[in-house]
Structures are given as C-alpha cells and as structure tokens.
C-alpha cells in the first residue's frame, strides 16, 4: 500500500487514515496562515 502504513485491523487502518487527514488539514491551515502573514 502506498505509504507504508501497516495494520492487520481494518478499523485501525481507518483510524490511521482519519489521523492523517486531520494532520493534513491542520498543517495545510498553518501553511496557508504563514503565506497570508508574509
């Protein structure tokens, strides 16, 4: 699978994707904020 995440539990896999999505959203917001402040 694409990013090397490995888990035997499907629910754990979904949780990992949710965390990844959350982090992407937070980091994306921070990046936009930094660009705005420049």
């Amino acid at each position: 699978h694409s990013d090397g995440i490995f888990t035997d539990s499907y629910s754990r896999y979904r949780k990992q994707m949710a965390v990844k999505k959350y982090l992407a959203a937070v980091l994306g917001k921070r990046y936009k904020q930094r660009v705005k402040n420049k």
Epitope: H1, S2, D3, I5, T7, D8, S9, Y10, S11, R12, Y13, R14, K15, M17, K20, K21, A24
Partner: antibody, heavy 117, light 112 residues
C-alpha cells in the same frame, strides 16, 4: 443516496489485463473507502482490495498482491480496478462497494469479465 | 486469513416459518474499538449483494424486522423469524475486523 455505476462487460484473452471503472455520485467520494469484491459464476464473494482516494492509499488482498492495481480519480469521482495476467479462473462479476460503518453499504451493479481464448 | 464457515449450505423453510443461518469465524471478530464487524448480506439472482445487518446485530434501515442478527466473538446467527416469498436468496456473512476481509460460503434459502 450514494450510487455506484460500473463500466460494461468485458471479454479478455488469457495473459491480458482488464480495467473496470466505478463512478460514484451522491456522496463524498474522496473521503470514502472504496472496495472491490469479485464473484466467480455460481461461487461466493472474494475481497480484492480497497482505496482511500484522499491519499490514494491502497490495501490489497494477499491473493491478488502484484496482480491488482486500484486507483481513483477524484476529479470524476471514479475508482478503477485493473487486474493483470488474466487466466480463466478470473472470469467473474467484479463489484465496487463503498464502506459505511465498517461494512459495505453501497454496491455497484457489477461488471462481468470473461477470460477466454 | 480469518476463515468464515457458514452452515447450512442450503435451507428449505415453509412460508411463515423461522429460518436460522449460522456463521463461525476462526478468530474473534471483536475489535479493539469495542465493535464486532460481522455483517450479513442478501443476494438475489442477477443482483448485487445488499447489506442486511452490520456490527453483528444492527439492522440496515429499510430492512424488515423479521431479520435479526445475534452473536459475539466467533459465533453468529442470522434469523428470519417468518419467511416470506421475497426472502428467497443467498445469504452471506463476512467479517470486516481483520485484513484480509473474508466471506462465508453462503447459504441458499428456499421455500419448502
């Protein structure tokens, strides 16, 4: 209401590849877990793999590892399943299905792939 | 892989009578999140499968209440309390707890 519409039936030669599409409407495609399941004639169901379109993250059944590729095009809300090195045993109806609550809530109508020389 | 064993393979029941299908998994399907990802599907000839039951006992909306799911751990049951003509189909259990996701072999329900 989520709807999944799959591409039409295919007849393929042994050793070739097939690519089946599944177009989703009425839901958030990118944030869905899209699975592929197949059913050989008169047989049971077999899970092939999944894709999470936001990250294009895939997970494949061991049996199909190296032979199946699942992709997604977020711009058209379409998932694809490509199976290579086809053999007669791959003759089956191929379904896409979307997960909700850890279970397949929505299914495509199925695509019959016939492998014959 | 988790092996899902369904019994019986086929079942003939009189209209209005109870139909019981069993499903056994080779490993517990209780997940670390407290849920049991055991599902039941109904498939009629020439149609895609349809979700009936998920989380072992939660009925899909719109599914008649004559269908019920029960069980925990490794042993599960689908019960049709009063068989109707439109219930003639193949029923599959499948587990969504562990990769690879796996299905039972199916139970064909017919009218006696």
């Amino acid at each position: 209401e989520v709807q999944l519409v799959q591409s039409g039936a295919e007849v393929k030669k042994p050793g070739s590849s097939v690519k089946v599409s599944c177009k989703a409407s009425g839901g958030t495609f990118s944030d869905s877990y899209m699975h592929w399941v197949r059913q050989a004639p008169g047989q049971g169901l077999e899970w092939m793999g999944l894709i999470y379109p936001i990250f294009a993250d895939t997970r494949y059944a061991q049996k199909f590892q190296g032979r199946v590729t699942i992709t997604a095009d977020e711009s058209t809300s379409t998932a694809y399943m490509e199976l290579s090195s086809l053999r007669s045993e791959d003759t089956a109806v191929y379904y896409c299905a979307i997960d909700q609550d850890g279970s397949f809530a929505y299914w495509g109508q199925g695509t019959l792939v016939t492998v014959s020389s | 892989d988790i092996v899902m064993t369904q019994s019986p393979d086929s079942l003939a029941v009189s209209l209005g009578e109870r139909a019981t299908i069993n499903c056994k998994s080779s490993q517990s399907l209780l997940d670390s999140d407290g849920k049991t990802y055991l599902n039941w599907l109904q498939q009629k000839p020439g149609q895609p499968p349809k979700r009936l039951i998920y989380w072992a006992s939660t009925r899909e909306s719109g599914v008649p209440d004559r269908f019920s799911g029960s069980g925990s751990g490794t042993d599960f049951t689908l019960t049709i309390s009063s068989l109707q003509a439109e219930d003639v189909a193949v029923y599959y259990c499948w587990q969504g707890t562990w990769f690879d996701l796996t299905f039972g072999g199916g139970t064909k329900v017919e009218i006696k």
